[in-house]
C-alpha cells in the first residue's frame, strides 16, 4: 500500500526541496504533524501543538502548514516518506506517502560540427537521465540520451537547437551553423 | 468508555496457525491506528504489529511474513493472523490503541498464546 | 533497533517516600517516550506520555522528565497500590521498544 499510493516527486542534487501535503488544510483540531523516513525506519521530524517541533537534523524544517523541507538534497535523501497527521485526541486524521528520487540537473548541452562530412554532435556532459533533442531550423530530428550525431544534407546553413532535460531541469543550445561550398573545416 | 476484548488465543504446536480478534467499542476504532503487543513469560514486554487508520502496516522484524495485522472497521474489529508459529512466540498477546500513531493508551485484557509441541 | 535500558530492576521504599525510575535509549529519541503501569494481575495503563506529559486520570503524584537519551518517571509520595512493574517505551523509530521493566516494592 505504502507504495502504490505513493506521490511521486522530483528534486534536485544539491536544491532544497519541499514535500508539501495535498489536500491539508491546518486547524486548531491538529496537535500532531509526524515525517518518517522509511528506509531509516524513524520520525524525522514531528510538530506538535504548543510543544518545540522536533527536527533529526538542520538539514529538515516543518512549516507551520505541515510541508517538510529537505535542504541541499543529497543522493541518499532520496526515499519514501510518510506524514501522518493526528487531532487533539489522538485520532489519525491523514497519512500520505511521498516517494522522493532525486536527479542531478542536466549541463548546457554542448554543440560541435564538422563541415568536412556535414556532421553536427551534441553531448550533455552532466545529469541524471537527461533527454537530448536536436532541431534543425525548428524541426526535430533526434532524440537520444547522452549524445547525438546527426548528418545533414539539406543545405551548409542552419540553425541547430539542442535541448537537454530530466524531470529537475532543462538546457538547451542555439548554434548557426555555416558551411563553406567545399565543405572546409 | 473504551474497551478492547481480545481473543483467540490457545494452544498450538510449532508451525501452527492461530487468528487473534479484538473487539473495540467505546471510541471511534477507524480513526485510530491500533497495536498487537506481547508479554514473555518473562515478563518483557515487546511490541510486535501496527496498522494505522488509513491502512499502513508495520512490523517487527522476527514476525514479518508470518503475522499479519488487519482490521474491519465496519465491525470494529481487529485481528493478527499468525502463521508458522514458534515457541519464542508464546506470550499474552494484547490489543492497544495507538493514540497519535504512538503510546498504547488503552489496552485489552490479553490473550494467551502458547506454542509448544 | 533502539535499545531502552531501566535501573535499577527492583526499587524498594517506604509509603510516603519520593521514587524515581530511570529508563535510558541507545540514541537520542527527544521527547518520544512513554511510561506505563502494570500491576501483578492487570494490563499495562499509561501513566506519562512524551516523557513529561500527563494522561487524564492519572494522580498527580506521578510525573516525567528528561529528553535526548536519558529519562526519569518519578513518584513523589508513594502509596501501597502503586506497587507495579513500570515500563518506558519509545516510539522515535520502528520497531517500538520497551524497556525490560523496573519492579517497585513496598517496605
Known amino acids: 500500500k505504502e507504495i502504490t499510493n505513493a506521490l511521486e516527486t522530483w528534486g534536485a542534487l544539491g536544491q532544497d526541496i519541499n514535500l508539501d501535503i495535498p489536500s491539508f488544510q491546518m486547524s486548531d483540531d491538529i496537535d500532531d504533524i509526524k515525517w518518517e523516513k522509511t528506509s531509516d525506519k524513524k520520525k524525522i521530524a514531528q510538530f506538535r501543538k504548543e510543544k518545540e517541533t522536533f527536527k533529526e537534523k538542520d538539514t529538515y524544517k516543518l512549516f507551520k502548514n505541515g510541508t517538510l523541507k529537505i535542504k541541499h538534497l543529497k543522493t541518499d535523501d532520496q526515499d519514501i516518506y510518510k506524514v501522518s497527521i493526528y487531532d487533539t485526541k489522538g485520532k489519525n486524521v491523514l497519512e500520505k506517502i511521498f516517494d522522493l528520487k532525486i536527479q542531478e540537473r542536466v549541463s548546457k548541452p554542448k554543440i560541435s560540427w564538422t563541415c568536412i562530412n556535414t556532421t553536427l554532435t551534441c553531448e550533455v556532459m552532466n545529469g541524471t537521465d537527461p533527454e537530448l533533442n536536436l532541431y534543425q531550423d525548428g524541426k526535430h530530428l533526434k532524440l537520444s540520451q547522452r549524445v547525438i550525431t546527426h548528418k545533414w544534407t539539406t543545405s551548409l546553413s542552419a540553425k541547430f537547437k539542442c535541448t537537454a532535460g530530466n524531470k529537475v531541469s532543462k538546457e538547451s543550445s542555439v548554434e548557426p551553423v555555416s558551411c563553406p561550398e567545399k565543405g572546409l573545416d | 468508555e473504551v474497551k478492547l476484548v481480545e481473543s483467540g488465543g490457545g494452544l498450538v504446536k510449532p508451525g501452527g496457525s492461530l487468528k487473534l480478534s479484538c473487539a473495540a467499542s467505546?471510541?471511534?476504532?477507524?480513526?485510530?491506528?491500533m497495536s498487537w503487543v506481547r508479554q514473555t513469560p518473562e515478563k518483557r514486554l515487546e511490541w510486535v504489529a501496527s496498522?494505522?487508520?488509513?491502512?499502513?502496516?508495520y512490523y517487527l522484524d522476527s514476525v514479518k511474513g508470518r503475522f499479519t495485522i488487519s482490521r474491519d472497521n465496519a465491525r470494529n474489529i481487529l485481528y493478527l493472523h499468525m502463521t508458522s508459529l514458534r515457541s519464542e512466540d508464546t506470550a499474552m498477546y494484547y490489543c492497544?490503541?495507538?493514540?497519535?500513531?504512538?503510546?498504547?493508551?488503552?489496552w485489552g485484557q490479553g490473550t494467551s498464546v502458547t506454542v509448544s509441541s | 533497533d533502539i535499545l531502552l535500558t531501566q535501573s535499577p530492576a527492583i526499587l524498594s521504599v517506604s509509603p510516603g517516600e519520593r521514587v524515581s525510575f530511570s529508563c535510558r535509549a541507545s540514541?537520542?529519541?527527544?521527547?518520544?517516550i512513554h511510561w506505563y503501569q502494570q500491576r501483578t494481575t492487570g494490563s499495562p495503563r499509561l501513566l506519562i506520555k512524551y516523557a513529561s506529559e500527563s494522561i487524564s486520570g492519572i494522580p498527580s503524584r506521578f510525573s516525567g522528565s528528561g529528553s535526548g537519551t536519558d529519562f526519569t518517571l518519578s513518584i513523589n509520595s508513594v502509596e501501597s497500590e502503586d506497587v507495579a512493574d513500570y515500563y518506558c517505551?519509545?516510539?522515535?523509530?520502528?520497531?517500538?521498544?520497551f524497556g525490560g521493566g523496573t519492579k517497585l516494592e513496598i517496605e
Open positions: 467505546g471510541f471511534t476504532f477507524s480513526s485510530y491506528d
Open positions: 492497544a490503541r495507538s493514540s497519535y500513531g504512538e503510546l498504547m493508551d488503552y
Open positions: 540514541q537520542r529519541i527527544g521527547t518520544s
Open positions: 517505551q519509545q516510539s522515535h523509530g520502528w520497531p517500538f521498544t
Open positions: 496498522i494505522s487508520g488509513g491502512g499502513f502496516l
